[in-house]
């Protein structure tokens, strides 16, 4: 009931709780006095659920029978109303509609660890929507019975508080589970099991690692486990993957050696317990131990690529480049490089180590055969060292190879494919392709790059280290033995015409024709391989279409003749540039008379 | 699901009678109070006479009170609305309802779902 009720009741039969899809009759009757002040035909008495009007009588008591109320609670409430006033409240009532429980399933019990304590959980079922008690018993053996009882509206879980102890593993315990509503009951089926089958170990707790003589390969992992603890699973991994290695162990008293981890790894190790072979269950994982294996010396060898340049009749620039060993091979960290240079037939060497550093340039003799050996060292030691012959790499005409195309493919990329060198095309033992942004100053601090090809291979696909918009000098190179031979082309990933023109720094006249000399494109405006120059010109204060000169691009060169112009006119000059997507705006514009005598 | 369905509606002179009737169905008629609502032309619902759930109590809007008479049949699941003496200011379309749903002190629209067509009453010379 809600309020006090002094004015009248609100009656609610057979119950204030009842089965969905059941009939209630509600009766409101006021007390003697309690109508209105005139006679009791204008007592208007109305019966409301919640705050909808949905009956009404005029007397002294209403009669309703309700059908399909919904599950939950729904509140009932009486008021009277009375000629020129207000309602007045007379009283109401709350009907609780649910349904009986359902068995309660897959009761199942688990003690955590050997000193832990008895919990069950279960699955109730559909909700009553009703107050619904919950009985949780177990019995075990000599009588013994421990009952505990929950009364939350979703109860599922209960703890018993006590602890099964490992005295006989194999005695009998049996739960059950029984729900209790005013609708009716219902009980689990039981569940039997023993302390085996029930206690769940602890995780196993203060994981370290050793490695005996700093070696990878002499790895023992040791854990403390609770005292019954049969087996254990581990589990590692690399800190960086997603796929876990997985080793079983019986009776590992709390240690296990490691054979297969790799060097230099972070690895992330986890271990579980159990009591049983085939009884029980798992427990959680431990908590994660991150260590760093020891590093090992390096495997491997490197990837050495050089460069000669010519300095005088004497000396040559010799510049050495290789690439970082992979992590797997590297096994550490890259303490320092060691080079050493030596001359072939008088047997002289010099070793020098570099850090922070993958290329190493040195300036040598012209004469004499010289050969470098690059290697990588780290705290255990140096990977074997690449050895390599300085030769002339494009000394050997026959084996340069031919048809040399570079054609963009995709976002930063560049398709090199050629043709086999006309000398037999079996000698050739790797090619490589090398790479670097062309800079028209031949600048030899601009990155190198390369990669290395199979002999039956006639294509490379370049893509690191490749800009949109930037010209590339590619060289394919043919080895065999102490020869070489090669062919350069340019090629870009991506084009389009250049932003501006050539500026014209000077015009100078020489026998009746004109020098013209131009100042290079800065590369950023470049965007991508200059084709072609043109030269434009036409006289000055004319609207004739200009003439014009078209020369074929070549890195070094930035001046030209023309011989065209007539004595004493003067023309007005400028220059374009093409790249494969189109020309150039204009450079600038310059005035020129030719002075020489007229025919 | 529920249904209410009127008829009897028609055109009728200033004085006339008319009886109408809603047919109800898909709930448990005999226990729930009804209702006769109307709307008339451009304007809003106006409730118009409620019965109780055993027939005992009936209710009047003061615009009909002693000419118009509600009464029910729970053996036909039938409601019934007797109109005498009509004036033009009847003219509306009339609808039956749970008590519930539309009650002298307010309707609820989102239960108009529940409601029949109506059935149209013209008062006029």
């Known amino acids: 009931k809600i309020d006090a009720c002094k004015r009248g009741d609100v009656t609610v039969k057979p119950s204030h709780v009842i089965l969905l899809g059941s009939t209630v009759n509600i009766t409101c009757s006021l007390k003697p006095r309690q109508g209105c002040f005139h006679y009791s035909r204008r007592n208007k008495l109305i019966l409301y659920k919640f705050d909808r009007r949905i009956n009404f009588h005029h007397g002294h008591s209403l009669n309703s029978q309700v059908t399909g109320l919904p599950l939950g609670t729904t509140l009932f409430v009486c008021k009277l109303a009375c000629i020129n006033s207000d309602e007045i409240q007379i009283c109401g009532a709350e009907i609780f509609v649910g349904v009986a429980p359902e068995q309660p399933q897959n009761l199942s019990c688990i003690q955590k660890g050997e000193q832990g304590t008895v919990a069950c959980t279960w699955e109730r079922g559909r909700d009553t929507h009703l107050y619904t008690e919950y009985t949780l018993q177990l019995s075990g053996p000599k009588n013994l019975t421990w009952q505990k009882q929950c009364k939350d509206i979703y109860c599922d879980y209960l703890d018993f508080g006590i602890n099964l102890t490992p005295e006989s593993p194999e005695s009998n315990f049996t739960a059950k589970v029984t729900a209790v509503n005013s609708l009716g009951s219902s009980s689990s089926l039981p569940s039997t099991f023993t302390f085996l089958d029930i206690v769940r170990p602890l995780p196993p707790w203060d994981i370290r690692i050793k490695f005996q003589k700093a070696s990878v390969s002499r790895c023992t992992l040791y854990w403390r486990d609770e005292g019954l603890v049969l087996l254990n699973r581990l589990r590692y991994r690399p800190s960086n993957s997603r796929l876990w290695n997985m080793v079983n162990v019986t009776k590992a008293k709390g240690r296990h050696d490691l054979l297969d981890l790799k060097p230099f790894t972070e690895y992330e190790f986890q271990i579980s317990s159990k009591l049983h072979l085939y009884k029980g269950s798992w427990s959680d994982w431990s908590e994660s131990l991150r260590a760093q294996t020891p590093e090992e010396e390096p495997t491997g060898m490197l990837d050495v690529w050089y460069m000669k340049r010519h300095i005088d009749y004497s000396r040559q620039q010799i510049s050495l480049f290789w690439k970082n060993l992979s992590v797997s091979e590297a096994r550490g960290k890259i303490l320092h490089y060691q080079v050493t240079l030596q001359e072939l037939t008088g047997g002289k060497a010099m070793t020098q180590n570099i850090t922070g550093h993958t290329s190493w340039t040195t300036v040598i003799p012209r004469t004499g055969n010289w050969a470098v050996a690059v290697s990588a060292a780290n705290s255990k030691g140096s990977s074997l060292p690449t050895r390599i012959n300085i030769m002339n790499l494009c000394e050997a005409g026959l084996l340069a190879p031919r048809q040399v195309s570079a054609n963009s493919e995709g976002m930063d990329n560049i398709l090199v494919t050629w043709q086999p060198p006309r000398k037999d095309p079996s000698a050739v033992q790797e090619y490589v392709v090398e790479w670097r942004e062309l800079h028209p100053g031949g600048d030899t601090q601009v990155p190198l790059n390369w990669l290395r090809s199979r002999p039956y291979n006639v294509s490379a696909l370049i893509s690191e280290n490749i800009k949109s918009y930037i010209c590339y000098e590619i060289r394919v190179y043919a080895l065999s033995g102490d020869q070489g031979g090669c062919s350069s082309i340019l090629g870009n990933s991506k084009h389009k015409a250049p932003l501006s023109g050539p500026h014209i720094n000077a015009i100078t006249e020489e026998k009746g024709s004109i020098l013209i000399s131009w100042n290079s494109i800065p590369v950023q405006e470049q965007m991508g391989c200059l084709l072609h120059y043109r030269i434009y010109w036409k006289e000055r204060d004319s609207n004739s279409q200009p003439q014009l000169c078209e020369i074929p691009y070549r890195v070094s060169q930035n001046s030209h003749p023309i011989n065209s112009l007539q004595p004493r006119v003067t023309y007005v000059l400028w220059m374009t540039a093409l790249t494969a997507a189109g020309e150039s705006s204009h450079g600038n514009e310059r005035e020129f008379c030719l002075q020489g005598k007229a025919n | 699901q529920v249904q209410l369905q009127e008829s009897g509606g028609g055109l009728v002179q200033p004085g006339g009678s008319l009886r109408l009737s809603c047919k109800a169905s898909g709930f448990t008629f005999s226990t729930y109070a009804m209702s006769w609502v109307r709307q008339a032309p451009g304007k809003g619902l106006e409730w118009v006479s409620a019965?109780?759930?055993?027939?005992?109590?009936?209710d009047y809007a003061d615009s009909v009170e002693g000419r118009f008479t509600i009464s029910r049949d729970d053996a036909k699941n039938m409601l019934f609305l007797q109109m005498n003496s009509l004036k033009a200011e009847d003219t509306a379309r009339y609808y039956c309802?749970?008590?519930?749903?539309?009650?002298?002190?307010?309707?609820?629209?989102?239960?108009?779902?529940?409601w029949g067509q109506g059935t149209q009453v013209t008062v006029s010379s």
């Open positions: 309802a749970k008590y519930e749903d539309c009650s002298d002190y307010m309707c609820h629209r989102d239960r108009a779902g529940y």
């Open positions: 019965i109780n759930s055993g027939g005992l109590s009936t």
